[in-house]
């Protein structure tokens, strides 16, 4: 008789999750000769500890924990690059320019990027047919807790001018409820972090409007100047433009602005 | 079994491109770094730079850095390595090779190579 | 980058030999070293990684000893399979570095 499972409303954990995180961990020390150090198999193990056998909408900070002594990495706190619903460009960029990371670009984001996972309580077992929704199941979901945990620690991280990426074709170019908004916005340290700079990309090719002065922008900038952190934001009209001139910033095309 | 398999051997002009092919086979292709390494005819092996099929970055020695692009197609399980401005100094055996992940960093799987002969 | 220097060049010896082959790097790379033999028209193989680790299908002939800035391989008796020549490789930080070579001929 086969034994009743919970059904969630997300999709269940992806395909070769083990393989997938123990591959991207040994290729990440592959190509951050740095981070050589890291025993990629004590990284599976607490990744693993931190959801296995547990109830997945039952998961905190804690439970990570051994995963995040095991991912502690220094990035430069004053090259670090958020972003909000424009994740495919903001790796561009620091594809690009080698010297700034977004969270994505440390170990701990490379392994879990683009990767769903869960357990069940009580059994070893992960669970490939669903997981819990943020909002349809619960928030306390070992994919959530896992972002907010690493996305506060990388915000408490940065100092001096803190760059982010927002995306100008959205209703909410800066969303209270993104991960951004709710997580590395109320993490920046006042102490450390002298500015904010916001990025906002726009979509339309012909798209002239000064995106700084969105509601939610004036929001944005409300929030972090109570929080005794400067604001500034610059318009972004033509990311491939963009893109380009990080790349070659000695083209002639690259005064004018993009 | 693994396999790396690399395009035919190509005759190029000096200021041209080539773009060799290196299909990979008996793995999961996003789960390894792929490298490119080239030989000139009696010379020392000499690393160019590095792609993750998985994201599609890449890194390459200073040296190529601008004539030298390696790209991947996933659903071919394919990675390719394209160097611009040849000169006949870029006649060489050019390979592409990975790491087994349980032997350190070094390459435990190479593909036969291709030859590659830039003539004026 | 680091330099990766082989010694020597040229190597003639017999079958049954022993034989050592030196590789200095410009820099501590602690034991992130590997040593490839190459026959003519053919790719590379890996034999020692992470400067004394037999890689699989290696003969116990082979090894590999050093740390920091000074290798050796060592053949500990030649078999006429082994005339061919043998690279060094640094794997410590981008770029990797090959040494010159070292070609090892029967005497």
């Known amino acids: 008789v086969p034994r009743w499972r919970q059904q969630w409303s997300g999709p269940g954990t992806t395909k070769r999750f083990p393989e997938t995180v123990l591959a991207r961990c040994v290729k990440y020390t592959e190509i951050h000769p740095e981070m050589r150090h890291v025993d990629c198999q004590s990284v599976w193990d607490a990744f693993k500890g931190a959801f296995i056998s547990k109830h997945p909408c039952n998961i905190t900070e804690e439970d990570y924990q051994p995963l995040m002594k095991l991912g502690t990495q220094t990035v430069p706190c004053n090259k670090i690059l958020l972003w909000s619903r424009i994740k495919d460009l903001a790796h561009q960029f620091t594809q690009v320019q080698r010297d700034m990371f977004t969270l994505e670009d440390t170990l701990l984001g490379y392994l879990a990027d683009d990767l769903t996972w869960c357990g069940e309580f009580n059994t070893s077992k992960i669970n490939y047919q669903s997981c819990p929704d943020w909002r349809k199941d619960c928030s306390n979901n070992p994919v959530s807790v896992f972002w907010k945990t690493v996305s506060r620690r990388f915000a408490e991280a940065a100092c001096d001018v803190v760059h982010v990426m927002l995306n100008g074709s959205r209703s909410k170019i800066f969303d209270k409820n993104s991960t951004f908004g709710s997580v590395e916005v109320h993490n920046l340290q006042p102490e450390k972090v002298q500015t904010l700079e916001a990025w906002v990309i726009h979509g339309g090719r012909e798209d002239s409007r000064d995106l700084c002065q969105d509601p939610t922008i004036k929001e944005l900038e409300s929030i972090i100047s109570k929080r005794n952190i400067q604001f500034s934001c610059k318009n972004i009209y033509r990311p491939d433009k963009f893109l380009q001139c990080v790349k070659n910033p000695e083209d002639s095309s690259c005064t004018s602005e993009i | 079994q693994m396999q790396l398999v690399q395009s035919g051997a190509e005759v190029k002009k000096t200021g041209s491109s080539v773009k060799v092919s290196c299909k990979a086979s008996g793995y999961t292709f996003t789960d390894y770094i792929m490298h490119w390494v080239r030989q000139a005819p009696g010379q020392a092996l000499e690393w160019m730079g590095w792609i993750d099929p998985e994201y599609g970055r890449t890194d390459y020695a200073q040296k190529f850095q601008d004539r030298v692009t390696i790209t991947r197609d996933r659903s071919m399980s394919t990675a390719y390595m394209e160097l611009s401005s040849l000169r006949s100094e870029d006649t060489a055996m050019y390979y592409c090779?990975?790491?087994?992940?349980?032997?350190?960093?070094?390459?435990?799987?190479w593909g036969q190579g291709t030859l590659v002969t830039v003539s004026s | 980058d680091i330099q990766m220097t082989q010694s020597p060049s040229t190597l003639s010896a017999s079958v049954g030999d022993r034989v050592t082959i030196t590789c200095r790097a410009s820099e501590d790379i602690y034991s992130n070293l590997a040593w490839y033999q190459q026959k003519p028209g053919k790719a590379p193989k890996l034999l020692i990684y992470?400067?004394?680790s037999l890689a699989d299908g290696v003969p116990s002939r082979f090894s590999g000893s050093g740390s920091g800035t000074e290798f050796t391989l060592t053949i500990s008796s030649l078999q006429p399979d082994d005339f061919a020549t043998y690279y060094c490789?640094?794997?410590?930080?981008?770029?990797?570095?090959f040494g010159q070579g070292t070609k090892l001929e029967i005497k």
């Open positions: 992470d400067a004394n």
């Open positions: 490789q640094q794997y410590n930080n981008y770029p990797y570095t």
């Open positions: 090779a990975r790491s087994a992940h349980t032997t350190g960093f070094g390459f435990a799987y």
